[in-house]
């Protein structure tokens, strides 16, 4: 506990001290006192620097001295053989004797009691700024006027700070302008104008004049400007060592001037004014600014465009244009938005054809579709090539955006037909020589394939079964082989308006107009063994001279079979109608008069006993294309005959392209068209 | 040359097992259905068993019917009948006998064109 | 189950002879059976298939006819190879059954 007065005597005052003693006092007397200490008595053995025997005395780390020996008063009026003065409050005092004494030595008494100190004067740091006044047991300090009083209790500055302004144009200036600024203050002065506005200070170099920097190029007073996250300073000296004009960028700013307690200068003055948040003219490239000027500041809309072939992409959704404003941050909007190349997507895939995947999709891009040769082609034309349009479509220059469309080639077989001998006289074929060949097993018969949708047969064929099983791509009929073929399912059947349809079918004698056609459920995929016939022209090319040679084939009777297991086909001439009216019906269910021969049936055979027979019925008598000798068309349908081996009738196909056309048309989904 | 050559027949006690092989070679035998017949000393032929060309279908006698049990493996060109619980009244020439089956949905069945020399099955204690 | 009644069950005939064999089945088998020829420690052969069709290799002096119930195998002219016994057999559906046989003999 400090105390403001203390007595301190060596062990067994007035007495001998004794050996091998250390003691020491801890002197403590109340803050803002310094400490006298003086000593009365003093008899300690004497040895060269104290080294024996002493007193010590020590301020904070300082030997403020150490004493042996003897001491009288220099004063007849005063006690005091040794003194000292302290300016802190406390203070340690050290007696040590060592091991022997050669005579006795009675010690010390020492008293101490509390000063008051001069803070104004006695120590080497001034306390205050300004003006410092000494009170017992402490000091404190003022200001001159228009000073005040730093929180720190020692420090004097102007009140220069607070300031805030507004509005759009001002001056502001240093304390005291164009007289000396106050030494030792902190002045901030705050610009707060509307958003999209920038600060934009100017002053001239004469109206600066601040103190100069140090050695280390450190200013000593200094202005400096913050905006935002920029910083513009700090500067000194005598001229303004910045630019003239600084624009801020920001619609804040924020003016320190910081000066030291030395060197006044007389200050500083600016001026400052508001401009519109200017936005860049940036470079968005494949675009186009509207209007174009030459600076946008704040609030100024332009719509930027984007060149034919290039697109904003926001989202999912593509646009041509944007529009962009110049935004209170000097930023535009949308600024994000840029012209990409326009993407055409990945090409849509179309049937039966394909497209290579593109090295890119974006605008200009080309791409090509081909059909799967050789089962298809390109019917709508064009060349198949697209190219990426501007308007993010794949165009080509025939068809514009409207996709190819792959349709099987008809009447084209794999491999040529060669004769070896079986259908009546016929011989064993593959598939691939009759790739349009269809297998209707309920009741046993053939049909042809003339497109992915449809098949031609006769009517007789489907009149009692209106949803037939139909298989594809098979030369062998046996069960295990049509199971691992194309079957294929009946959407409707349509028999010719023509055929007479009986209660009793067995007993028919009139196969005129005996033609039908089957709409399939799924489209026909063509290939080697799969692939329709073609339908004959309507010009008079196509009508069959007495003569002209046809390919048939089937499963039908042979003269070995009542069904043949692998496929049939023979070469017939076409005969005049007369030499099937000649021959004799086999079992017939009716006198032979009453069976009917129009001109809508062809006759054919009485060569070698080829002819088509039982199980036959539906299937093509295909007849080379005049007008393309690759091609087959379907001329006839196995019809009926009077014997098997002889002569057989066959529907004329010509007589019926209108009606199977416009079955075809009128029955059409979406999905083939 | 199309052929079927049986194998497996025996003398067996009755309740015994006996399991009969039929090898077939000349022609693609998964093509075809298969059945067996059999003919007792001094009897008539009675139809034992058939078969589908890919063993999805098959038919017994009621004489047999839980008791044999017809497979083939058409990697093996081969045709099996499978015989538990026999009796004395199975005892008989087992043939084999291929079958032909025309059309898709709506079958043609050809029955046993052609035949095996068989294979003697005995059953006795 | 179908069943196949086979009459006669043996007949003598003499080389030249015509021979007819018939077959009725318990119900309408269409003409959905077969015919067959056995020789004494032979397997059979198939003669007609589809009731009426000859198998090809067969002589044309055999001949099938018939569909529904009634079913006849006619040999317009007995060879001396034709001595043997012949079955029917209905095919129309599980279980197949073969008719008990005719026993054709030299008179």
């Known amino acids: 506990e400090p105390t403001m007065y203390g007595e301190i005597l060596s062990p067994n005052y007035p007495q001998a001290y004794p050996s091998e003693v250390e003691k020491s006092w801890d002197i403590e007397v109340p803050e803002g006192y310094g400490i006298h200490l003086y000593f009365t008595h003093l008899d300690i053995e004497l040895s060269e620097n104290c080294a024996y025997d002493s007193v010590q005395i020590i301020s904070g780390d300082t030997e403020e001295g150490r004493l042996c020996g003897q001491r009288s008063s220099n004063n007849p009026h005063s006690p005091i053989v040794e003194e000292f003065q302290v300016p802190y409050n406390k203070l340690q005092v050290i007696f040590k004797s060592d091991f022997s004494n050669e005579e006795r030595f009675t010690g010390f008494a020492a008293y101490y009691v509390a000063t008051d100190i001069n803070e104004c004067t006695d120590f080497v740091d001034v306390p205050c700024s300004h003006f410092c006044n000494n009170f017992i047991g402490g000091y404190f300090c003022s200001c001159p006027p228009e000073y005040f009083l730093h929180d720190d209790m020692k420090n004097c500055g102007v009140n220069c700070s607070g300031d805030v302004f507004t509005a759009l144009i001002g001056e502001i200036a240093s304390p005291n302008y164009p007289k000396p600024y106050p030494e030792n203050s902190r002045c901030e002065y705050q610009i707060r104008l509307e958003k999209g506005f920038q600060v934009v200070v100017t002053l001239r170099r004469e109206d600066f004049d601040v103190e100069a920097a140090d050695s280390a190029g450190n200013c000593l007073d200094s202005l400096v400007f913050v905006a935002g996250d920029r910083q513009f300073g700090p500067y000194c000296g005598h001229g303004f060592p910045g630019p003239l004009n600084i624009e801020t960028k920001s619609n804040a700013l924020d003016i320190i001037f910081q000066t030291d307690l030395t060197g006044q200068k007389k200050g500083w003055k600016l001026r400052y004014h508001g401009d519109p948040m200017p936005c860049p003219k940036e470079d968005t490239p494949n675009s186009v600014w509207e209007p174009a000027k030459a600076k946008y500041v704040f609030r100024d809309v332009v719509q930027i465009t984007c060149l034919d072939g290039f697109e904003v992409v926001e989202g999912r959704v593509g646009a041509t244009s944007f529009y962009s404003t110049c935004q209170s941050n000097g930023k535009w909007s949308n600024s994000k938005l840029k012209c990409q190349p326009v993407d055409c997507g990945i090409p849509e895939s179309i049937e039966n054809g394909k497209v290579e995947d593109p090295e890119s999709t974006l605008f200009g891009s080309v791409i090509r579709y081909t059909c799967e040769e050789p089962y298809y082609y390109m019917e709508n034309g064009g060349g198949g090539e697209y190219h990426c349009a501007g308007n993010g479509s794949w165009v080509n220059e025939v068809l514009g955006p409207e996709l190819p469309k792959c349709v099987p080639v008809c009447g084209v077989p794999r491999e040529p037909f060669e004769e070896k001998q079986r259908i009546i006289g016929g011989s064993d074929a593959d598939i691939k020589n009759f790739p349009w060949q269809v297998f209707f097993d309920n009741p046993w018969a053939g049909g042809a394939l003339i497109n992915e949708y449809w098949v031609l047969t006769a009517a007789h064929v489907v009149e009692g079964n209106r949803e037939p099983t139909m298989y594809v791509g098979s030369t062998s009929v046996q069960t295990s082989r049509l199971a691992k073929s194309k079957m294929l399912t009946p959407e409707h059947v349509f028999i010719h308006p023509g055929w007479k349809l009986l209660e009793v079918p067995e007993g028919r004698t009139n196969f005129d107009n005996d033609i039908a056609l089957v709409r399939l459920k799924d489209p026909v995929k063509m290939g080697p063994t799969v692939s329709p016939i073609c339908l004959p022209g309507t010009s008079s090319d196509y009508n069959l001279m007495d003569g002209d040679l046809g390919l048939i084939s089937g499963w039908g009777r042979t003269e070995k079979r009542d069904r043949a297991v692998r496929l049939k086909a023979a070469r017939l001439p076409v005969a005049p109608l007369r030499k099937c009216k000649e021959v004799k019906v086999e079992k017939p269910t009716a006198d032979a008069e009453a069976y009917v021969f129009t001109p809508n049936m062809i006759c054919a055979g009485g060569e070698k006993g080829m002819d088509s027979c039982k199980g036959d019925s539906g299937g093509a008598f295909a007849v080379q294309d005049p007008n393309d000798k690759t091609k087959f068309y379907a001329a006839g349908l196995v019809s009926w005959g009077p014997q098997c081996g002889t002569y057989g009738l066959y529907t004329r196909v010509k007589n019926y392209v209108d009606w199977i056309m416009k079955t075809m048309q009128e029955n059409s989904t979406p999905r083939e068209d | 040359e199309v052929q079927l050559v049986e194998s497996g027949g025996g003398v067996v006690r009755p309740g015994g097992s006996l399991r009969l092989s039929c090898a077939a070679s000349g022609f693609t035998f998964d093509d075809y259905g298969m059945s067996w017949v059999r003919q007792a000393p001094g009897k008539g032929l009675e139809w034992v068993s058939g078969?589908?060309?890919?063993?999805?279908?098959?038919g017994y006698a009621d004489s047999v019917k839980g008791r044999f049990s017809i497979s083939r493996d058409n990697a093996k060109n081969s045709l099996y009948l499978q015989m538990n619980s026999l009796r004395a009244e199975d005892t008989a020439l087992y043939y084999c006998a291929r079958d032909e089956q025309l059309g898709g949905l709506k079958y043609y069945y050809y029955y046993m064109d052609v035949w095996g020399k068989g294979t003697t099955v005995t059953v006795s204690s | 189950d179908i069943q196949m009644t086979q009459s006669p069950s043996s007949l003598s005939a003499s080389v030249g002879d015509r021979v007819t064999i018939t077959c009725r089945a318990s119900?309408?088998?269409?003409?959905?059976l077969g015919w067959y020829q056995q020789k004494p420690g032979k397997a059979p052969k198939r003669l007609i298939y589809?009731?009426?069709n000859l198998q090809s290799g067969v002589p044309s002096r055999f001949s099938g006819s018939g569909s529904g119930t009634e079913f006849t195998l006619t040999i317009s002219s007995l060879q001396p190879e034709d001595f043997a016994t012949y079955y029917c057999l209905q095919y129309h559906s599980y279980p197949l059954r073969f008719g008990g046989g005719t026993k054709v003999e030299i008179k």
């Open positions: 078969i589908n060309w890919e063993g999805g279908s098959t």
């Open positions: 119900q309408g088998i269409r003409n959905d």
């Open positions: 589809t009731a009426s």
